[in-house]
């Protein structure tokens, strides 16, 4: 039943070109190249893509033509290694070109940069964008793919094609509208926010595969798909998990053509077999390919079958528990996870994986005991504290969020996390804490039954951002420990961290707290980031500062910015009042 078993093709590049079509082929090759060589100019990438495309066409015409039998990694790697400025631009990444496949591709993958030194994307005026769109639509859309791909080197490539399709639709519609800006800007904001979320979710999938292995990813997929498709049989879920794992392994490994092709096949299979998978797929399956795949990935959970029997009969009372565990460990644990997950759409995936791990640990111990059944009879009782911990945490934090609102809730988290891991860079602490704080508006509005899967699985995505950014420049053993010990226990590990008593406070630097009139022209979001950056720096200077002290300083700071932005001579106000504020803050915090 494997969806992906295909006949061997004489020419892999011809096969993928024919399967995907020229437009998707070119777009995916551009994404692949931009994700590997993140600093290369757009024009250079377009040139490389055109050369690869022309070559692919010769192979479509004659699969026996020279070099057409080479693997895609060989063809693409050879092409990337023709870039003249490789050594100057990328330094040691150029050494990858001395290696043979598959080591060369692995080398390129290792040099992907999650935080590339690229300028922030500034959105031009609407009229400027519309003119560029009308002048050369193809180049305009390629530029979008290029700019997103190079900034997000693990973006899920077939999903980026879907974003590009929506991007094009937004410009097609809005550039003809009476009020172009009113039409276009909300759509672009939505695409930007969804794109960041999509990138972060995919980054977690790739981290799961690359750092914790295929088994970890498959466990995650069994749990999530069982929640989503609770009426599907275990065999069906297992088959979908195997195929989904292949798709994500390919995309995370840079095999974007294979990934997109296999994702399309998987969507086709799911739609052809909806009756045995889920009743919620009908609408998705009526859509065109890119929309269909996206829709399936986001589809709501199906209703749980009525009268599911107690799990105890199969996994505690059964005579065959240890036999199954000994002879078919992963299948048996997979069945446990499937049965538990389909009954608990109200649990986060990471909680379900913790329960499965606890069950596994118990069987590991008990199946070697004198009386196994007596030993594991109470295993389900061990689940209670594991379930209650995230429930209580979410309850407390949602109460805090409702009391404070998003901005102040983010600030509370900024203080909390800076005290836990003060060695982490300020931009990373601000970015991660802001995202952690968004859990409030994202999840607290949900009823109890949907809060945990929303909140804890979202936090897993955000904490993975912290982990990948920290891995690039490791500064904290505590972060390394929480990030590497257990994928499913990352959030509890960070939650359990107390104030780092070993931290030596940062030297006070007045320059850090010097502000200028340019803050007045910033958007509300940018202004918040400036204030939150200052807050992190304050905590790094004075980690033992109380909430009340920090609140007083931040309130004074907000009043200072508001006052000076209203002043006639803003710059003078910032200079003079700024000095006073710094002195008052130092006094208030005892610096």
């Amino acid at each position: 039943r494997g969806v992906f078993r295909r006949d061997a093709h004489k020419s892999e590049v011809a096969h993928r070109f024919k399967d995907l079509g020229e437009e998707n082929f070119k777009a995916l090759v551009l994404i692949a190249f931009a994700q590997y060589l993140q600093q290369c100019p757009f024009e250079d990438h377009v040139k490389l893509v055109n050369e690869v495309t022309e070559f692919a066409k010769t192979c479509v015409a004659d699969e026996s033509a020279e070099n057409c039998d080479k693997s895609l990694h060989t063809l693409f790697g050879d092409k990337l290694c023709t870039v003249a400025t490789l050594r100057e631009t990328y330094g040691e990444m150029a050494d990858c070109c001395a290696k043979q496949e598959p080591e060369r591709n692995e080398c390129f993958l290792q040099h992907k940069d999650d935080n590339p030194n690229l300028p922030r994307l500034v959105r031009p005026e609407v009229d400027v964008m519309c003119t560029a769109f009308h002048d050369n639509e193809e180049t305009f859309l390629k530029k979008y793919l290029y700019e997103i791909a190079r900034r997000h080197p693990y973006f899920y490539a077939p999903e980026l094609l879907f974003f590009a399709k929506r991007y094009k639709a937004a410009f097609t519609e809005c550039c003809q509208a009476a009020d172009k800006a009113a039409c276009l800007l909300p759509k672009l904001d939505e695409l930007r926010d969804e794109g960041k979320a999509s990138s972060a979710k995919q980054r977690l999938k790739c981290a799961s595969l690359q750092k914790f292995g295929e088994r970890a990813f498959k466990a995650w997929a069994v749990a999530r798909l069982s929640q989503r498709f609770p009426k599907a049989e275990f065999a069906e879920v297992s088959k979908l998990v195997t195929d989904l794992t292949k798709v994500h392994t390919e995309c995370c490994h840079g095999d974007l053509l294979e990934c997109a092709d296999d994702r399309a096949d998987l969507a086709k299979y799911i739609c052809e077999n909806q009756d045995s998978i889920s009743s919620k797929l009908k609408e998705c399956c009526e859509k065109p390919l890119l929309e269909k795949s996206h829709c399936i990935a986001e589809v709501e959970n199906d209703e749980m079958p009525a009268d599911l029997p107690s799990l105890a009969a199969d996994f505690v009372e059964s005579k065959d528990v240890c036999k199954n565990y000994a002879e078919a460990k992963d299948v048996f644990l997979g069945m446990f996870l499937y049965e538990y997950a389909r009954r608990h759409p109200d649990y986060s995936v990471v909680l379900l994986l913790r329960l499965a791990k606890t069950y596994e640990t118990t069987l590991e111990k008990c199946c070697a005991a004198a009386d196994p059944h007596e030993c594991y009879a109470k295993v389900f009782d061990e689940f209670k504290p594991l379930v209650e911990e995230p429930q209580n945490l979410i309850k407390q934090n949602c109460e805090l969020f409702e009391q404070l609102g998003e901005y102040k809730f983010q600030n509370a988290l900024l203080v909390r996390y800076t005290k836990k891991v003060p060695q982490v860079s300020t931009p990373t602490l601000v970015e991660v804490s802001r995202n952690l704080g968004k859990v409030g508006s994202k999840c607290c509005k949900h009823p109890e039954a949907k809060r945990m899967p929303c909140a804890e699985d979202y936090l897993s995505v955000v904490l993975n951002q912290l982990c990948v950014l920290h891995e690039k420049t490791p500064v904290s053993d505590r972060v390394t420990k929480c990030c590497t010990e257990s994928l499913v226990n990352r959030r509890p590990c960070f939650s359990a961290l107390e104030v780092d008593e070993t931290y030596v406070p940062k030297e006070f630097n007045a320059e850090t707290f010097t502000f200028h009139a340019d803050i007045c022209t910033l958007s509300e979001k940018e202004r918040q980031i400036k204030k939150q950056t200052a807050l992190v720096e304050l905590v790094k200077h004075k980690p033992k500062a109380t909430k009340e002290q920090l609140k007083a300083v931040m309130d004074d700071f907000a009043a200072f910015v508001e006052k000076c932005c209203k002043a006639d001579d803003k710059e003078t106000c910032f200079a003079e009042e700024g000095k006073k504020l710094v002195a008052a803050s130092q006094a208030a915090l005892g610096l």
């Epitope: 599907a232 049989e233 275990f234 065999a235 069906e236 297992s238 029997p309 009969a313 199969d314 996994f315 009372e317 059964s318 005579k319 065959d320 036999k323 199954n324 002879e327 078919a328 299948v331 048996f332 069945m335």
Partner: nanobody, 126 residues
Framework: EVQLVESGGGLVQAGGSLRLSCAAS????????VAWFRQAPGKEREFTAG????????YYLDSVKGRFTISKDNTKNTVYLQMNSLKPEDTAVYYC???????????????????WGQGTQVTVSS
């Protein structure tokens, strides 16, 4: 929908042998565990033997271990129960049953099985 049809039952002397067959349609036995249950007059159905689907594991009632052997032929979509050294207490109606989509037997509780054959009578005379 899964259809199960048993055959191979009959009357046999103690110490003799029989081979029961369970032919499945609408479901491949290669991916689903299949169980044999038996029910003697006036008694409850009891799990007798089982075989994993896509996982090579066999399961037996303690009293039949060493005498009965369960096997399957994926090409014929059929599961067999080879019964040797039969005893009068093996007399019962033998049923084939499945819980769809499960590669393992995780419970011997008859109430948890969704699909059943019509049964085949086995009588062992002394």
């Amino acid at each position: 929908e899964v259809q199960l049809v048993e055959s191979g039952g009959g009357l046999v002397q103690a110490g003799g042998s029989l081979r029961l067959s369970c032919a499945a349609s609408g479901r491949t036995v290669s991916s689903t565990a299949v169980a044999w249950f038996r029910q003697a007059p006036g008694k409850e159905r009891e799990f007798t033997a089982g075989i994993g689907g896509s996982v090579d594991i066999t399961y037996y009632l303690d009293s039949v271990k060493g005498r009965f052997t369960i096997s399957k032929d994926n090409t014929k979509n059929t599961v067999y129960l080879q019964m040797n050294s039969l005893k009068p207490e093996d007399t019962a109606v033998y049923y084939c049953a499945v819980r769809p989509g499960r590669p393992l037997i995780t419970s011997r509780d008859a109430n948890l099985y969704d699909y059943w054959g019509q049964g085949t009578q086995v009588t062992v005379s002394s």
